[in-house]
């Protein structure tokens, strides 16, 4: 399986909400002995590998933001802790999973990574990740809504997140 990032760049005005999205692609084994661990974290564009370093998102670690379930099941993070920080991660039945960040500030700008760990027979692991950049802007040059740039081409889409 692979992880796709529909958008590689999100440009948002301060105060807006945004939902960053990743999608699980390819054959997903829904067997009894296969589970998926999904999470989010901030990182940096490393010289060797992007998303290698795991930094917190608004003081919440990847441990706080994880989802753990089988196949294409729906799931949400524990609401209380994440929502106090204006965050929520979620997963649907179609392999999409996301993190929503509310009331963006300039400090939220940076590289965000989604991580999927496929666990087979409870201990054999396969890891994949996706990366996307969030730019939070302020002032007269800031867009009125979030503008997202698809990963494949640089045509922008205006969205109200």
């Amino acid at each position: 399986f692979k992880v796709a990032t529909p958008y590689s760049l999100y440009v948002c005005p301060e105060g807006q909400n945004v939902t960053l999205t990743c999608r699980l692609l390819g054959p997903v084994d829904k067997g009894h002995d296969v589970t998926f661990y999904k999470t989010w974290y901030r990182s940096s564009r490393g010289e060797v590998q992007t998303c290698s370093e795991r930094r917190p998102i608004r003081n919440l670690t990847f441990q706080d933001l994880h989802l753990h379930h089988g196949g294409h099941q729906a799931a949400n993070t524990s609401h209380d802790l994440a929502q106090r920080h204006g965050l929520e991660s979620a997963s649907d039945h179609h392999g999409n999973f996301s993190i929503t960040m509310r009331n963006l500030t300039l400090l939220d700008s940076g590289l965000y990574c989604c991580l999927v760990v496929e666990i087979r027979h409870h201990h054999s692991e396969h890891r994949v990740h996706g990366a996307m950049e969030l730019q939070v802007q302020t002032g007269k040059d800031a867009p009125s809504n979030c503008v997202v740039y698809p990963s494949s081409s640089q045509e922008s889409e205006n969205i109200t997140a």
């Epitope: 661990y37 060797v48 590998q49 290698s52 441990q63 994880h66 753990h68 524990s78 991580l115 760990v117 666990i119 409870h122 201990h123 054999s124 692991e125 890891r127």
Partner: antibody, heavy 118, light 107 residues
Framework: QVQLVESGGGLVKPGGSLRLSCAAS????????MYWIRQAPGKGLEWVSY????????YYADSVKGRFTISRDNAKNSLYLQMNSLRAEDTAVYYC???????????WGRGTLVTVSS | EIVLTQSPATLSLSPGERATLSCRAS??????LAWYQQKPGQAPRLLIY???NRATGIPARFSASGSGTDFTLTISSLEPEDFAVYYC?????????FGQGTKVEIK
């Protein structure tokens, strides 16, 4: 405070039994895979047993298979290791440690000493 | 199971010197390797994850590199509190295994 605290170690004769406990606090215990890892005096680290976050499945090192039983009670935030038919070579400090998929042992207890001697 | 071999077994150095520790795997572990520090009477502490990333709160004098079968932990300038035993551990294959440790002692 995020911590793991082991208890239940002590001196026991060969063939005897002990039950170790590990109390977790400050984090969502039911999210984590848990391990018992031991360290014989002056030696390195050796994993003993593993239990998934839900309590199943369970794995044991060959050296303890059939003699040790790992279990957990997520409602009590506790991990256990029942050790039977103890041998001199089981003498070690026993640590509990937490783990997540694609991650490492980022939290350990301070350990409890098990001495098997006649 | 994957065997991790650490060298040297003991490293005798003075404070301020550079320490270079090695960990070699019997087969590739990709970048799924961690380093731990253990001081006498204490539990191990995670220093480095995924071969080269410092865990939370670990000083910048600790750095690490490598992938596949050969890995290195470097302490750029030894502080008194760095004298300890260092272990590598892999999670690419089951079971999770540790190296036998390298003791960094005061010369």
């Amino acid at each position: 405070q995020v911590q793991l605290v082991e208890s239940g170690g002590g001196l026991v004769k060969p063939g005897g039994s002990l039950r170790l406990s590990c109390a977790a606090s400050g984090f969502t215990f039911s999210d984590y895979y848990m391990y018992w890892i031991r360290q014989a005096p002056g030696k390195g680290l050796e994993w003993v047993s593993y239990i998934s976050n839900s309590g199943s499945p369970i794995y044991y090192a060959d050296s303890v298979k059939g003699r040790f039983t790992i279990s957990r009670d997520n409602a009590k935030n506790s991990l256990y290791l029942q050790m039977n038919s103890l041998r001199a070579e089981d003498t070690a400090v026993y640590y509990c440690a937490r783990d997540l998929p694609g991650w490492y042992f980022d939290l350990w207890g301070r350990g409890t000493l098990v001495t098997v001697s006649s | 199971e994957i065997v991790l071999t650490q060298s040297p077994a003991t490293l005798s150095l003075s404070p301020g010197e550079r320490a270079t520790l090695s960990c070699r795997a019997s087969q590739s572990v990709s970048s799924y390797l961690a380093w731990y520090q253990q001081k006498p009477g204490q539990a191990p502490r995670l220093l480095i994850y995924d071969a080269s990333n410092r865990a939370t709160g670990i000083p910048a004098r600790f750095s690490a590199s490598g992938s596949g079968t050969d890995f290195t932990l470097t302490i750029s300038s030894l502080e008194p509190e760095d004298f300890a035993v260092y272990y590598c551990q892999q999670r690419n294959n089951w079971p999770r295994t540790f190296g036998q440790g390298t003791k960094v002692e005061i010369k």
